[in-house]
């Protein structure tokens, strides 16, 4: 025998109080699949949250975060404070990255600078709190007569023919 509730489409619920007929989800609720015996409460996007997509009878609301905060967790279940580049969020708030670490985003943790020597390379540009070091050619490549980097051709001055 087929369950009469299986005929109830998304946006409705199978109402036991009304002889299992399909009733529309009440305001502030939804059912995203058919055959539901209850509708789920719509999520509210208030306070630090903003509504990205309104709740409908067939789908839940979707939230994002107010400026200065970013989403964390499945479906933006939390809003975490942004920090500046060169900082990370701790339990005491935003703190500058320690020497030797950097963060080039407004979220996440400070990460150690790349250790160029592990790849047999030298430091071309020093790291900062906001930026990783830039590794250059290996020290061996920089020895006289062993350059593997083709130097740029000298710029010609206008009005002069090549020698």
């Amino acid at each position: 025998l087929q369950d009469p509730c299986s005929n109830c489409p998304a946006g409705t619920f199978c109402d036991n109080n009304r002889n299992q007929i399909c009733s529309p989800c009440p305001p502030n609720s939804f059912s995203s699949a058919g055959g539901q015996r209850t509708c789920d409460i719509c999520r509210q996007c208030k306070g630090v949250f903003r509504t990205r997509k309104e709740c409908s009878s067939t789908s839940n609301a979707e939230c994002d975060c107010t400026p200065g905060f970013h989403c964390l967790g499945a479906g933006c279940s939390m809003c975490e404070q942004d920090c500046k580049q060169g900082q990370e969020l701790t339990k005491k708030g935003c703190k500058d990255c320690c020497f030797g670490t950097f963060n080039d985003q407004k979220r996440g943790i400070c990460r150690p600078w790349t250790n160029c020597s592990l790849d047999g390379k030298s430091v071309l540009v020093n790291g900062t709190k906001e930026r990783d070091v830039v590794c250059g050619p290996s020290p061996a490549d920089l020895s006289p007569g062993a350059s593997s980097v083709t130097p740029p051709a000298p710029a010609r001055e206008p009005g002069h023919s090549p020698q």
């Epitope: 502030n28 999520r43 509210q44 208030k46 630090v48």
Partner: antibody
Framework: QVQLQESGPGLVKPSETLSLTCTVS????????WSWIRQPPGKGLEWIGY???????NYNPSLKSRVNISVDTSQNQFSLKLNSLTAADTAVYYC????????????WGQGTTVTVSS | QSVLTQPPSASGTPGQRVTISCSGS????????VNWYQQFPGTAPKLLIY???QRPSGVPDRFSGSKSGTSASLAISGLQSEDEADYYC???????????FGGGTKLTVL
């Protein structure tokens, strides 16, 4: 289960600053709003303000110039500071957890009575 | 002056059904779910109904909530003497970006 406990002075002089702390036990302070509500003797409930665990705050416009709410997630505590007190600030002060999905205040502290008097 | 309007008092006899109304505006009840709280003398309020009509676990099904437009109501059927308490409605207010309360209704069981 989660429990809230208010602490602070019961008697404060006019023009001084009230400092109250709410300690959250039995659960995390993360992913909820934490509110302060007060109730003057024989009167109704008045929302003072809230703080989200990550630092977002909002205050009742009628009190905004005098109030500050802060959170210390490492101690699982949040605090209320209300300055320039007058006798009209005499009330029972409650801290409460506000759910961040449906926004009901589902856990309350037992309340602390604050009297403003010289 | 509370943002949400409730009658200051209501009464009923044991077994009766009583309703408490709560009136607001488009920025609060009209656009947001309503919560109800029960408060006994000398104790903290307790969440009784959330999201218009949902009961937290442990709340008897004698308590029910509903909302229409910018008004909401709390109904208590089969009134009991232990229901004598103050009842407050509350809703988020979009213009404040925070909650607003009704002034409270003192329910007396005669």
């Amino acid at each position: 289960q989660v429990q809230l406990q208010e602490s602070g002075p019961g008697l404060v002089k006019p023009s001084e600053t009230l400092s109250l702390t709410c300690t959250v036990s039995g659960g995390s302070i993360s992913s909820y709003y934490w509110s302060w509500i007060r109730q003057p003797p024989g009167k109704g409930l008045e929302w003072i303000g809230y703080i989200y665990y990550s630092g977002y705050t909002n205050y009742n416009p009628s009190l905004k110039s005098r109030v500050n709410i802060s959170v210390d997630t490492s101690q699982n505590q949040f605090s209320l500071k209300l300055n320039s007190l007058t006798a009209a600030d005499t009330a029972v002060y409650y801290c409460a957890r506000t759910h961040s999905y449906y926004y009901g205040m589902d856990v309350w502290g037992q309340g602390t009575t604050v009297t403003v008097s010289s | 002056q509370s943002v949400l309007t409730q009658p200051p008092s209501a009464s009923g006899t044991p077994g009766q059904r009583v309703t408490i109304s709560c009136s607001g505006s488009s920025s609060n009840i009209g656009n947001n779910p309503v919560n109800w709280y029960q408060q006994f003398p000398g104790t903290a309020p307790k969440l009784l109904i959330y999201s218009n009509n949902q009961r937290p676990s442990g709340v008897p099904d004698r308590f029910s909530g509903s909302k229409s437009g910018t008004s909401a109501s709390l109904a208590i059927s089969g009134l009991q003497s232990e229901d004598e308490a103050d009842y407050y409605c509350e809703a988020w207010d979009d213009s404040l970006n925070g909650p607003v309360f009704g002034g409270g209704t003192k329910l007396t069981v005669l």
